[in-house]
Structures are given as structure tokens and as C-alpha cells.
């Protein structure tokens, strides 16, 4: 009896543990049986063809390689697809930046919020804030709120994000706090 390939599945060969950015990764397309035995393989991610070997190899995986992968095995009778297999890539915080709301120029007495934005997997588990003197600030949240903001808060700030993979730091972002008309009037 001839039949299309059966029990097609994606199997991770290496690494044996979780996948970190920069790792060498090999995925194997397995199937239990096929008749006829001569088969072809196809790999796809998000509907895009990636390769035609039984293995899909990444010399140095990147966060952009994460996603849903499927392999297809076909013979002269028909083709069978695997279930989608999710490739997760763990990486240290990257693309960090300090954003400022309502902007980077704020009048004294108002509120200013600095947010440490990043891309990380797993998510950032620890935030550290620094000022222009590289002094660590006593804030532990993703958002640093100053309310009311003072002229003395003017300066450059940067943040560091940490997860189980590693650390990343932002460039400096400058907050300018200007005097209110009332203060100028009193002077």
C-alpha cells in the first residue's frame, strides 16, 4: 500500500537546552514512515520557503529568527506537514532607550516621566537608572516619575535593563527643565 509520509514533526537537535541569541541551532524534520520511501523536504516560516533539506541549520541564531516553523515531507503520493513549531530565542535587553513624557523639555513644577524602553526575551527583570555622573538613582521601575520636576533635575539620564541572559544599557537622554514664568517674574 502506498501512502503519503506519516507523523511529520519538527525536532530540535541542538542546542539541548534553551536557545540563546548567537547559538548554533539545528532543527530536524522527522517522519515515522513513507511509501514510497523517496521523499523531499521543505521548510517554511510564516509561509516563506527556507530550505529543502531534512535539517534546518542556523550558524548563529538571532532574535529575528524566532517564530513559527513547519516542515513538509512529500513523496509521489502526497505531502504531509508538521504541526507549527515555535522557535523562541532568548536574548539580553537590547535597543534600550530613555523616552521622556511629555517631552524632553518640561517646565518646573510639572510632571516628567522617563521610561526605559527595551526589547528583551525574557522581559527585563531589573531596571537600574543612572544620572549624568553615572550615579545610580534610587528607582527600580521601568518608569521614573518626577513630580513636581525641578530645574535641578535637568541633565542626562540613562538606564540599564537586566534579564536572565544579560544586561543592556541605553544611550544618554537629556531632560531640560526650564523656569516657570512665576519664577522668572520673581527674579
Amino acid at each position: 500500500v502506498q501512502y503519503a509520509p506519516r507523523d511529520v514533526r519538527v525536532r530540535k537537535i541542538k542546542p539541548l537546552s534553551e536557545i540563546h541569541s548567537g547559538n548554533s541551532v539545528s532543527l530536524q524534520c522527522d517522519f515515522s514512515s513513507s511509501h514510497p520511501k523517496e521523499v523531499q523536504f521543505f521548510w517554511e516560516k510564516n509561509g516563506r520557503l527556507l530550505g529543502k533539506e531534512s535539517q534546518l541549520n542556523f550558524d548563529s541564531i538571532s532574535p529575528e529568527d524566532a517564530g513559527s516553523y513547519s516542515c513538509w515531507v512529500n513523496n509521489s503520493i502526497g505531502q504531509t506537514a508538521s504541526k507549527a513549531w515555535t522557535l523562541e530565542v532568548l536574548y539580553a535587553p537590547r535597543r534600550l532607550r530613555v523616552s521622556m513624557s511629555p517631552g524632553d523639555q518640561v517646565m518646573e513644577g510639572k510632571s516628567a516621566t522617563l521610561t526605559c524602553e527595551s526589547d528583551a526575551n525574557p522581559p527585563v527583570s531589573h531596571y537600574t537608572w543612572f544620572d549624568w555622573n553615572n550615579q545610580s538613582l534610587p528607582y527600580h521601575s521601568q518608569k521614573l516619575r518626577l513630580e513636581p520636576v525641578k530645574v535641578q533635575h535637568s541633565g542626562a539620564y540613562w538606564c540599564q535593563g537586566t534579564n536572565s541572559v544579560g544586561k543592556g544599557r541605553s544611550p544618554l537622554s537629556t531632560l531640560t527643565v526650564y523656569y516657570s514664568p512665576e519664577t522668572i517674574g520673581r527674579r
Epitope: V124, P138, Y139, S141, Q142, L144, L146, E147
Partner: antibody, heavy 120, light 109 residues
């Protein structure tokens, strides 16, 4: 008004674990860091660590890493502290305290404390 | 780890001015230590008074003020009242964690 209601006193055996809770009310829970402080007659007040309830990000005093684990449940506006592998040294009153920002941070509001006694 | 030292006890009279200080073994206390002052009354009732060296918390009476005096942080109560009898703790930010002082027991007689 702001209130931090802590769970009741605990008598626990050495080697065991305990979870303390701190239920916040009267403000938006995710807007402020929650800190935990230990008080003993010998060492006075000691800062354990802090959690950002919005993201779950934490910071710990090196002395308490591995001893305390801080978590927060946004749906119930409750912060938790797990204390593990308890010894007599962990017998203390533990406080949660809301960290306010203003122009500078301060330990604004405090819970009433939870007494933990570790004894065989 | 830095050790933060306070006077163990002080006594004052109603209407008098009293200053409590907070010293760090790590060196001079500066604005980068964000000195905090916390009041403890009987039954574990804690209240934050001062943050960032000299920022009085909302609702805290104006007679409480924070400053730096020499190489120490200071809490001054100008015109002490009987209800100010309490234990006062300072806390200093020490690069990546807070360190509390041992507390000053203030008696207002």
C-alpha cells in the same frame, strides 16, 4: 486614603517557607514601587528589596537574594514576599512600604507589619 | 556595606528646636544619598517625613525640615511638640540599596 494591609502573624518551623501579603488600597497599585523592610532588635531596619507592580521588575539587597522573593498581583492589588529556608535569624517584623516619588523618592506609607517567628 | 549611625537618644522640651543627624561610614553624606527620614510611633506606626535630603512629604508639618550639615544628613524639628515623641530613622541610598540608621529615640518632656 492610602492603606497597606498586611497579613497576620506567622509561627513557622526552621527550614520552612512563608508567604507574607500586603494588600494596597486607596491608590492605583501599579503606579508606585512597593518596598519591603525587616525590623529586628539587633539589626534595626533593613531594606530587603522592591518591586514594580506594573512590570514585575525587582531589586534586592544582596543580603536577601535567595532568601526573599517579591511578586505582585495586579488584579488584587496585592504584593507578596516569600521567605525561604527560614532560620531563627529570620524572626522579625516585616513591613511593606509604598515608595513615593515627588521630586525625590521617600518611604511614604507603611503597612502595620507582620511578625514572623521561626521556632521549633 | 556602609553603616549608618544616628544618636541613640535625644531629649528636648516643647517649643525647642532639636536636630537629629545621620552619618555614613562610607564618607560624607551628599544629595546623591537621597536621605530619607521616617518616624516610628508606638504599635509599629511608621510615617515617611522627608525624601531626597530636604523634600518634605505632603501633609508633614512645616516644623520638620531636612538638610545636610557638614558631612551628615540632618532632621530639624523647629518648635518640637509632645506628639513628636517617637523614634526617627534615617535611610541613605548607597549606590544600589538603601541602608537604615539605628534610629534616634526622641523624648519631648
Amino acid at each position: 486614603q492610602v492603606q497597606l494591609q498586611q497579613s497576620g502573624a506567622e509561627l513557622v518551623r526552621p527550614g520552612a517557607s512563608v508567604t507574607l501579603s500586603c494588600k494596597a488600597s486607596g491608590y492605583t497599585f501599579t503606579d508606585y514601587e512597593m518596598h519591603w523592610v525587616k525590623q529586628t532588635p539587633v539589626h534595626g531596619l533593613e531594606w530587603i528589596g522592591a518591586i514594580d507592580p506594573e512590570t514585575g521588575a525587582t531589586a534586592y539587597n544582596q543580603k536577601f537574594k535567595g532568601k526573599a522573593i517579591l511578586t505582585a498581583d495586579k488584579s488584587s492589588s496585592t504584593a507578596y514576599m516569600d521567605l525561604r529556608s527560614l532560620t531563627s535569624e529570620d524572626s522579625a517584623v516585616y513591613y511593606c512600604t509604598r515608595y513615593d516619588y515627588g521630586s525625590s523618592p521617600w518611604f511614604a506609607y507603611w503597612g502595620q507589619g507582620t511578625l514572623v517567628t521561626v521556632s521549633a | 556595606q556602609a553603616v549608618v549611625t544616628q544618636e541613640s537618644a535625644l531629649t528636648t522640651s516643647p517649643g525647642e528646636t532639636v536636630t537629629l543627624t545621620c552619618r555614613s561610614s562610607a564618607g560624607a553624606v551628599t544629595t546623591s544619598n537621597y536621605a530619607n527620614w521616617v518616624q516610628e510611633k508606638p504599635d509599629h506606626l511608621f510615617t515617611g517625613l522627608i525624601g531626597g535630603t530636604n523634600n518634605r512629604a505632603p501633609g508633614v508639618p512645616a516644623r520638620f525640615s531636612g538638610s545636610l550639615i557638614g558631612d551628615k544628613a540632618a532632621l530639624t524639628i523647629t518648635g518640637a511638640q509632645t506628639e513628636d515623641e517617637a523614634i526617627y530613622f534615617c535611610a541613605l541610598w548607597n549606590s544600589n540599596h538603601w541602608v537604615f540608621g539605628g534610629g534616634t529615640k526622641l523624648t519631648v518632656l
